[in-house]
């Protein structure tokens, strides 16, 4: 079940994957939480979507996100991250036809309705981290990651030499 009221839920078929051009290599539904186990939730407010980072009550179901995984031809610098040296990218969709997108000008993460092929702002390079965590780097802005700021998702610039393990850009995926 999804936490967005009045929004179509995913079925087993998930999305129509017959995209022109780039196509995913696998798809699955997962809930997204922070390193500190706060849930990422989505709400429809005034005909637009808001993304929240919050502690969930025990009886409340976590919102699910459709993760579509894509291979990039760019080499992966991290051992174990890619296959045959390919980087992995993901798109994240909490409800049909809406995707998380990076707004680099506003340093924000937003939900937008869009048609395929998806814009580059909807793609994030997937990085495996310790503690069963991952991080999401903007395809359009290397070094900038989805992170948590003031109980919202935001874009956070990370200095590779210092803070790649910074807790505010670490996320957990669970079923």
């Amino acid at each position: 079940a999804f936490g967005i009221s009045g929004v179509p839920k995913y079925t087993r078929a998930l999305h129509d994957s017959s995209i022109t051009g780039i196509s995913p290599i696998t798809e699955s539904l997962a809930s997204l939480s922070t390193y500190n186990d706060q849930s990422i939730t989505f709400a429809l407010e005034d005909e637009s979507y808001e993304i929240y980072v919050e502690d969930l009550k025990k009886d409340k179901k976590k919102d699910k996100v459709l993760l579509s995984y894509y291979e990039s031809q760019h080499p992966s610098s991290e051992s174990g991250d890619g296959v045959d040296g390919k980087m992995l990218m993901v798109t994240l969709s909490p409800t049909k036809d809406f995707w998380l997108q990076a707004n680099n000008k506003e340093h924000s993460v937003e939900l937008h309705k869009c048609e395929k092929p998806l814009p580059d702002q909807a793609f994030f390079v997937l990085h495996n981290r310790s503690f069963n965590c991952v991080s999401f780097e903007c395809k359009t802005d290397p070094g900038v990651f989805i992170g948590v700021k003031d109980n919202h998702l935001a874009l956070i610039k990370v200095d590779y030499s210092e803070n790649l393990g910074s807790e505010n850009i670490l996320f957990k995926l669970s079923e």
Partner: antibody, heavy 123, light 108 residues
Framework: EVQLVETGGGLIQPGGSLRLSCAAS????????MSWVRQAPGKGLEWVSA????????YYADSVKGRFTISRDNSKNTLYLQMNSLRAEDTAVYYC????????????????WGQGTLVTVSS | EIVLTQSPGTLSLSPGERATLSCRAS??????LSWYQQKPGQAPRLLIY???HRLTGIPDRFSGSGSGTDFTLTISRLEPEDFAVYYC??????????FGGGTKVEIK
């Protein structure tokens, strides 16, 4: 070199127990979901069980649910399959297999396979 | 449980001919489907993943297509080393995952 080596197979009586191990090397073990797949003599492939990279999620075929338990020790780079209440129809070569991509989730194809270990259940 | 039905069970062809193998799922698996080749006494070998992505190093005579419930593996021109058993495998959510019964491609 990326490698999976299964051990623990053998001849066992019906109702008995056996634990299979799969030692992994050459890759970051915890990044990958793992599965057990079996093949009865002269038959096709049958998926048995899978486990996520963290070990937090486990999945089973209906034919083994309640009898088999999959687990992993990421500190030892080892996958296990505990098989209880064994039946004649469990006789097969058991393969461990690694998913293609390091996404920790099990929803992926299998790229690396072990050589297999034969389990024979017979009185 | 999703059932994968492969057809035909056996395909008798000559080297140089085109092979078309079918895999039908009892319900949609999206693009979460792969194809394997297996020869006697060997472990399976991955050919195609994500329904249509050919693994690096696999000859381009192998191609996969389809999504949802109907999938096809095509071998454009059979080489002597291609005679083997081929399996499709679905890894859709939620499990259990399943394999098809296999198609044997044999020399005519």
């Amino acid at each position: 070199e990326v490698q999976l080596v299964e051990t623990g197979g053998g001849l066992i009586q019906p109702g008995g127990s056996l634990r299979l191990s799969c030692a992994a090397s050459g890759f970051t073990f915890s990044f990958y979901a793992m599965s057990w797949v079996r093949q009865a003599p002269g038959k096709g492939l049958e998926w048995v069980s899978a486990i996520s990279g963290s070990g937090g999620s486990t999945y089973y075929a209906d034919s083994v649910k309640g009898r088999f338990t999959i687990s992993r020790d990421n500190s030892k780079n080892t996958l296990y399959l505990q098989m209880n209440s064994l039946r004649a129809e469990d006789t097969a070569v058991y393969y461990c297999a690694r998913t293609l991509h390091g996404i920790r989730a099990a929803y992926d194809a299998f790229i690396i396979w072990g050589q297999g270990t034969l389990v024979t259940v017979s009185s | 449980e999703i059932v994968l039905t492969q057809s035909p069970g056996t395909l008798s062809l000559s080297p140089g001919e085109r092979a078309t193998l079918s895999c039908r799922a009892s319900q949609s698996v999206g693009i979460n489907l792969s194809w394997y080749q297996q020869k006697p006494g060997q472990a399976p070998r991955l050919l195609i993943y994500g329904a249509s992505h050919r693994l690096t190093g696999i000859p381009d005579r192998f191609s996969g297509s389809g999504s949802g419930t109907d999938f096809t593996l095509t071998i454009s021109r059979l080489e002597p080393e291609d005679f083997a058993v081929y399996y499709c495998h679905q890894y859709s959510q939620p499990p259990p995952f399943t394999f098809g019964g296999g198609t044997k491609v044999e020399i005519k």
